[in-house]
């Protein structure tokens, strides 16, 4: 049991894409406010989003310090206007989140095809290396920097005149594929982390087709 008219947060959920990480919970507060704490398994608790009436808290700055760590968060509930008040056990009411390991669980954002270039019967397709909020030496790392060879891309490509999707794979951000001369092709890419058990695939990139402005053609 907690303080009068204060309810514990519930449905604590991590929402994370390319390491941008937000903790969400319910309920919308009525006469109460929340404070969030986050910690690694072996670390100290750090408070964030003090006495907020929001039902989400951006924890990106904390988890990007080490994306391979496992984090736990907790949400404290306080009566509005009386944040010093505690529950019957002498401390505020709180609820724990599920554990969260960013490297293993962050969703892969929708990739983007940066460019494609045809030279004869070969096409080079390049995937944009998206920047993340993970830092090293004061610079933001790209998705490839963070995941290395764990991250692969699947290219789906097809003749504009047909529906069957051929596939190619790369653990860089470039594909070199064979195409039939004189045919226009369309492309879509998907990011994949095969070593994962959850959140293995991204959504597909927007489709790009030859004959549009992203492409170049050389004999």
């Amino acid at each position: 049991s907690g303080t009068t008219n204060t309810v514990a947060a519930y449905n604590l959920t991590w929402k994370s894409t390319n390491f941008k990480t937000i903790l969400e919970w319910e309920p919308k507060p009525v006469n109460q406010v929340y404070t969030v704490q986050i910690s690694t398994k072996s670390g100290d608790w750090k408070s964030k989003c003090f006495y907020t009436t929001d039902t989400e808290c951006d924890l990106t700055d904390e988890i990007v310090k080490d994306v391979k760590q496992t984090y736990l968060a907790r949400v404290f509930s306080y009566p509005a206007g009386n944040v010093e008040s505690t529950g019957s056990a002498g401390e505020p009411l709180y609820e724990n989140s599920p554990e969260f390991t960013p490297y293993l669980e962050t969703n892969l954002g929708q990739p983007t095809i940066q460019s494609f270039e045809q030279v004869g019967t070969k096409v080079n397709v390049t995937v944009e290396d998206e920047r993340t909020l993970v830092r090293r030496n004061n610079t933001f790392l790209s998705l490839r920097d963070v995941f290395g060879k764990d991250l692969i891309y699947t290219l789906y490509y097809w003749k504009s005149s047909s529906s069957g999707k051929k596939t190619a794979k790369t653990n860089t951000n470039e594909f070199l594929i064979d195409v039939d001369k004189g045919e226009n092709y369309c492309f879509s890419v998907q990011a994949v982390i095969p070593s994962r058990t959850v959140n293995r695939k991204s959504t597909d990139s927007p489709v790009e087709c030859m004959g549009q402005e992203k492409g170049e053609f050389r004999e």
């Epitope: 060879k149 999707k165 293995r200």
Partner: antibody
């Protein structure tokens, strides 16, 4: 435990249709790729086609293109092979298989038990 | 399409023998080759992936290697349960293609 179970095989007349199912358990099909492979009596393995259940993308062997359609229902965790305009040469045991990657190299780690399709008048 | 030419189509061997099966790809497939074992009336089972990696639970007497576009499956000491048909397969491009199979029989 990961399992694939095919069903729907049987005897069908030339020109007829049949729908095979591949029910998956122990994993989510949307996170993988599903292939269909067939084996005529006494013959080797022949690839039929694949689907990426997360986006519905498919590709087919030339021998079945225009006649066979692969689909998937992620809510049922099941892939399907719709076979139309069946011919005697489509007689085979049909397998579904789960594809995964080791870095960029694909492999098919789980296969169904197979279901026999016989096309005969 | 990439052709996978597998040889021999069949072989007879005794328990304890060293057995080698080869597959030649018609063009470069990098390491995107897998080997499968199939017994009569059963589904194929994965043995080797990425040309040389032993799949989980497969006995260590099985091994795979690559030299350019030539791929080899070796059984170092044939056991009674190894009498079966073996297939190579490339996944480098769509469509994936299988070798014709090698039937390993008891001498």
């Amino acid at each position: 435990e990961v399992q694939l179970v095919e069903s729907g095989g049987g005897l069908v007349q030339p020109g007829g249709s049949l729908r095979l199912s591949c029910a998956a358990s122990g994993f989510t099909i949307g996170s993988y790729w599903i292939h269909w492979v067939r084996q005529a009596p006494g013959k080797g393995l022949e690839w039929v086609g694949y689907i990426d259940p997360s986006n519905g993308y498919t590709y087919y062997a030339d021998s079945v293109k225009g006649r066979f359609t692969i689909s998937a229902d992620t809510s049922k965790n099941t892939a399907y092979l719709q076979m139309n305009s069946l011919r005697a040469e489509d007689t085979a045991v049909y397998y579904c298989a789960r594809a995964d990657y080791y870095y960029v190299d694909e492999y098919w780690d789980y296969w169904g038990q197979g279901t026999l399709v016989t096309v005969s008048s | 399409d990439i052709q996978m030419t597998q040889s021999p189509s069949s072989l007879s061997a005794s328990v304890g023998d060293r057995v080698t099966i080869t597959c030649r790809a018609s063009q470069d497939v990098n390491t995107a080759v897998a080997w499968y074992q199939q017994k009569p009336g059963k589904a194929p089972k994965l043995l080797i992936y990425s040309a040389s990696f032993l799949y989980s639970g497969v006995p260590s007497r099985f091994s795979g290697s690559r030299s350019g576009t030539d791929f080899t499956l070796t059984i170092s000491s044939l056991q009674p349960e190894d009498f079966a048909t073996y297939y190579c397969q490339q996944h480098y491009t769509t469509p994936p293609t299988f070798g014709q199979g090698t039937k390993v029989e008891i001498k």
